[in-house]
């Protein structure tokens, strides 16, 4: 089952995915696709990295974190209802059938209709990325009680949601993110 993340129409959605490179700069190819992870690689690819850089991306999809340190979380700009669905993050660890794959469910909610002051709109136009809003998972994915029901691989996608809490540090220290090498 997929871990669920939420965002409102017009916001930027955030889908977390991590791995720990074996050594600095020793990167692993990663792909993101719209749709569940297929047998290998990603279906309906929206973004790819190789051993050095991002080598393919489509409009509105980008990596906001430091992918050279293994933060390959996907940001989707200015989401619409059509962006709802399953997304695949696949970390293509070298070897035979060695990939780590994560299916993340993005739920887009209609925007709340609240009139914004003119000055706020001007600020948004001038600094659009400063107002990035990250989608959050359902409350139960952020409680200790639900963690035993979540795969270890899924925990790595939760770590970013929890990174400001002590639980995030506990997860990382216990190796919940993918370590390579």
């Amino acid at each position: 089952s997929e871990v669920e993340y939420r965002a409102e129409v017009g916001q930027n959605a955030y889908l977390p995915c991590f791995y720990t490179p074996a050594a600095p700069g020793n990167l692993v190819p990663v792909c993101w696709g719209k749709g569940a992870c297929p047998v290998f690689e990603c279906g309906n690819v929206v973004l790819r990295t190789d051993e050095r850089d991002v080598n393919y991306w489509t409009s509105r999809y980008w990596l906001n974190g430091d992918f050279r340190k293994g933060d390959v979380s996907l940001t989707i700009e200015n989401v619409t209802l059509a962006d709802s669905g399953i997304y695949c993050c696949r970390i293509q660890i070298p070897g035979i059938m060695n990939d780590e794959k994560f299916n993340l469910k993005l739920v887009i909610k209609p925007a709340k209709v609240t009139p914004a002051p003119t000055r706020q709109r001007d600020f948004t136009a001038a600094f659009p990325r400063m107002l990035t809003t990250r989608g959050h998972g359902p409350a139960e994915t952020q409680t200790l009680g639900s963690l035993p029901d979540i795969n270890l691989t899924q925990i790595s996608t939760l770590a970013n949601e929890l990174r400001d809490s002590r639980l995030a540090n506990d997860l990382r220290d216990s190796g919940a993110t993918i370590r390579i090498g």
């Epitope: 190819p29 297929p38 290998f40 293509q92």
Partner: antibody, heavy 119, light 108 residues
């Protein structure tokens, strides 16, 4: 124009080895996953193996795992299939195929090379 | 592994008729990850449809795919002489990649 040309097939005894090659042209070889698919005489298609563009990731069907090895040389635009411990049931036409940009399905195929395993 | 069962095994039709080929999966195929191929005697397969309904480059619009979950259909709206061949479905949603056993479309 995309072209895939297989070679290396032939008659081999059970337990023997064979190495198939597939010369590719007409596309940026290193950008695409590649696969081997086989077809026993008069039978349907069976996926055998796949390899990522860089060669770092490989996948195998259970029926060949541990016996077959897929590899590629991007400098030569060539795909390989090393087949060891061959069995009678490995007798088939072996097709080299290029995966689509979104891999897992095959948009160009070679004409195939026949491998016959018999004593 | 997902087993794909194609029916009928053989379809006998005349040029100009409509052909409907079925592919049923033993379990749900995620994200409609299903492709269709055509194979003529002595030739390599040719990709027709991927993602259950997207036509591959250069494929005439008389070929169409539909379906989701466990039931998929390839329709040839009006058979041309060159369409008589064997058709295979293939799923790529669950490891390993698997093909159906094929449906032969023959001239009646």
């Amino acid at each position: 124009e995309v072209q895939l040309l297989e070679s290396g097939g032939g008659l081999v005894q059970p337990g023997g080895s064979l190495r198939l090659s597939c010369a590719a042209s007409g596309f940026t070889f290193s950008n695409y996953w590649m696969s081997w698919v086989r077809q026993a005489p008069g039978k349907g298609l069976e996926w055998v193996s796949a390899i990522s563009g860089s060669g770092g990731s490989t996948y195998y069907a259970d029926s060949v795992k541990g016996r077959f090895t897929i590899s590629r040389d991007n400098s030569k635009n060539t795909l390989y299939l090393q087949m060891n411990s061959l069995r009678a049931e490995d007798t088939a036409v072996y097709y080299c195929a290029k995966d689509h940009w979104d891999p897992n399905f095959l948009d160009y195929w070679g004409q195939g090379t026949l491998v016959t395993v018999s004593s | 592994e997902i087993v794909l069962t194609q029916s009928p095994g053989t379809l006998s039709l005349s040029p100009g008729e409509r052909a409907t080929l079925s592919c049923r999966a033993s379990q749900s195929v995620s994200s409609s990850y299903l492709a269709w191929y055509q194979q003529k005697p002595g030739q390599a397969p040719r990709l027709l449809i991927y993602g259950a309904s997207s036509r591959a480059t250069g494929i005439p619009d008389r070929f169409s795919g539909s379906g989701s979950g466990t039931d998929f259909t390839l329709t040839i709206s009006r058979l041309e002489p060159e369409d008589f061949a064997v058709y295979y479905c293939q799923q790529y949603g669950s490891s390993p990649l698997t093909f159906g056993q094929g449906t032969k479309v023959e001239i009646k």
